[in-house]
């Protein structure tokens, strides 16, 4: 058993039929010695008396908020949560496996630049009695500070018969060094509590590996005289690291016909303009990627040819 | 050329070669997200590689103030990786394919390090750790780790030379 926060404790249980469970001793936080009774959750049924209560925690029925009282007055509370371990593996019932980029990916994170700011998100089908708490650091043995905000519900989607909820959190490295080569990964730890079930999820990454620039901005077409060619121009996204002479992007320009089956013409360039042939009913799209490190491409920015 | 005492390197040449190094490093080990090498334990093998750290002056301001600190750190790293790529980690079993980019990568590391430090001038270099994995699978894993680490190192070096070429070239 360990303390998650004040008056909230996590009991780690091996979860199998007829498991012995864990013996837990709760102590009433009071100078009083006599006339103390204990109750659990939303009930007046007395579970024991005395300054301490010894319970054998085996199932979710044994978890919950234990309260000690004297003469009708509440003295203190202890909330017990359960963390299940099945076949040596901690349960992952609360969050959905996103399966990208690999199986058992519960947390996904992205950064728009090298400033040390990043966003992580996760999915669940649970809609109520759900709380998250996020901590992060650079490295684990001698951790350096990363500050995370509160996790918030960022999207709701309908997937077949189920509703899916996306939560996200923004974090910022306290003393970020955008130009340095990272040697210690960022560690992100999410505590999830659903009713009386506790689970924790972790992700470890370098900012450089989760970079995904915003799409190029101000995408414009300039027709060239006496030609089917157009000059496409764009700018670096506002959110990208500066100076651009140091934090450079490379770009992919694509001409796509109306039909998905039509052949796509692609040009790669380090410049912020390119000359392409604009077909009727086609559209021109541009996306960006770090020039020197192959992290994710941005989403496409698009304009119609006409 | 970056002479230990002072003059500027051939920024544009260094920029071109470092960008080529980036391309080669990624073609040598393209499968990025599919193998999280940090999960594979064995940390000590890649802990000793030289990293371009915050105080090394490789940021735009540091380069403007005095690029020598940064160039020296890059040079150390290039020599270190060049030695690693020439070691039995890469020459031993399992043999690299004949058209493997590792050979070109090795030559380009050497080329860039010579651009930064011509014969006769010596910056102190970092001692290469004695890594001689016994099993072929250990060697393969170590190659992946080294290439992964090299990708991060040459990305920073390429940024330095691109910025230098754009803002510090005479």
């Amino acid at each position: 058993i360990w303390e998650l926060k004040k008056d909230v404790y996590v009991v780690e249980l091996d979860w199998y039929p007829d498991a012995p469970g864990e013996m837990v001793v709760l102590t009433c936080d009071t100078p009083e010695e006599d006339g103390i009774t204990w109750t659990l959750d939303q009930s007046s049924e007395v579970l024991g008396s005395g300054k301490t209560l010894t319970i054998q925690v085996k199932e979710f029925g044994d978890a919950g908020q234990y309260t000690c009282h004297k003469g009708g007055e509440v003295l203190s509370h202890s909330l017990l949560l359960l963390h299940k371990k099945e076949d040596g593996i901690w349960s992952t019932d609360i969050l959905k496996d996103q399966k990208e980029p690999k199986n058992k990916t519960f947390l996904r994170c992205e950064a728009k630049n090298y400033s040390g700011r990043f966003t992580c998100w996760w999915l669940t089908t649970i809609s109520t009695d759900l709380t998250f708490s996020v901590k992060s650091s650079r490295g684990s043995s001698d951790p350096q500070g990363v500050t995370c905000g509160a996790a918030t519900l960022s999207a709701e989607r309908v997937r077949g018969d189920n509703k899916e909820y996306e939560y996200s959190v923004e974090c910022q490295e306290d003393s970020a060094c955008p130009a340095a080569e990272e040697s210690l990964p960022i560690e992100v730890m999410v505590d999830a509590v659903h009713k009386l079930k506790y689970e924790n999820y972790t992700s470890s990454f370098f900012i450089r590996d989760i970079i995904k620039p915003d799409p190029p901005k101000n995408l414009q077409l300039k027709p060239l005289k006496n030609s089917r060619q157009v000059e496409v121009s764009w700018e670096y996204p506002d959110t990208w690291s500066t100076p651009h002479s140091y934090f450079s992007l490379t770009f992919c320009v694509q001409v796509q016909g109306k039909s998905k089956r039509e052949k796509k013409d692609r040009v790669f360039t380090d410049k912020t303009s390119a000359t392409v042939i604009c077909r009727k009913n086609a559209s021109i799209s541009v996306r960006a990627q770090d020039r020197y490190y192959s992290s994710s491409w941005s989403e496409w920015a698009s304009v119609p040819c006409s | 050329r970056a002479v230990p005492g002072g003059s500027s390197p051939a920024w544009t040449q260094c920029q071109q070669l470092s960008q080529k190094l980036c391309t080669l490093a990624w073609s040598a080990h393209p499968l990025v997200g599919h193998m999280d090498l940090r999960e594979e334990g064995d940390e000590e093998t890649t802990n000793d590689v030289p990293h371009i750290q915050c105080g090394d002056g490789c940021d735009p301001q540091g380069l403007r103030d005095n690029s020598q600190f940064c160039l020296q750190r890059i040079h150390q790293g290039l020599i270190f990786y060049e030695k690693l790529l020439g070691s039995d980690i890469f020459t031993g079993e399992p043999s690299l394919l004949p058209d493997s980019p590792v050979g070109q990568l090795h030559a380009s590391l050497l080329g860039l390090s010579q651009l930064l430090q011509p014969e006769g001038h010596h910056w102190e270099t970092q001692q290469i750790p004695s890594l001689s994995p016994s099993q072929p699978w250990q060697r393969l894993l170590l190659r992946f780790k080294i290439l992964r680490s090299l990708q991060a190192f040459v990305a920073v070096a390429a940024r330095v030379f691109a910025h230098g070429a754009a803002t510090l070239s005479p």
């Epitope: 009774t37 659990l40 959750d41 009930s43 049924e45 007395v46 579970l47 054998q56 979710f60 029925g61 | -």
Partner: antibody, heavy 112, light 107 residues
Amino acid sequence: QEQLKESGGGLVTPGGSLTLTCTVSGFSLSTYDINWVRQAPGKGLEWIGYIYRGSPYYADWAKGRFTISSTSTTVGLKITSPTTVDTATYFCTRNLYSVNVLWGPGTLVTVS
Amino acid sequence: LVMTQTPSSTSAAVGDTVTIKCQASQSISSRLAWYQQKPGQPPKLLIYSASTLASGVPSRFKGSGSGTDYTLTISGVQREDAATYYCLGSYSNTIRTFGAGTKVEIK
């Protein structure tokens, strides 16, 4: 003296609505669980649900069929659309499986 | 939560020992009570918290058990002990279930 007394039983037609009342005296409702338990003629005891500090909790089989509510001195049990299977003696109890257990005498409901 | 109570009925002579068992479908961590009910009366609490004797109950009644298995033992049964006995278990406080009952007859 601490006691509970059920009222409101009697003959009811199927589909009609019926509310039983448990009146408590000698103790405060806010301090205890008040349970409703029923017993069909010649059958065993069946727990319906309870209320504690205004929050009701029900047996799975009873959800939607019964509504438990409270005022400062009474606890109500509303039987929605009773059928013949709801014919039983209905008891209210203070607590069930620890100290301070107290049962009312019960009230008979006949659905016919 | 299902409480399986055995036997459904038993017959004993005065002075015999009667044993009634109750098995919960899930661990109920001693949140268990035993009741005695005689015809035309509300049930009377005998044992609570699996083994604590309720006030005014003769000491021949004894409760034991933990987890999912519980027992009520009547040592030296008396004529006035003829009644139906019920166990009641509680999983997570908010889920409570009675056993089906055991009818005890005195020969």
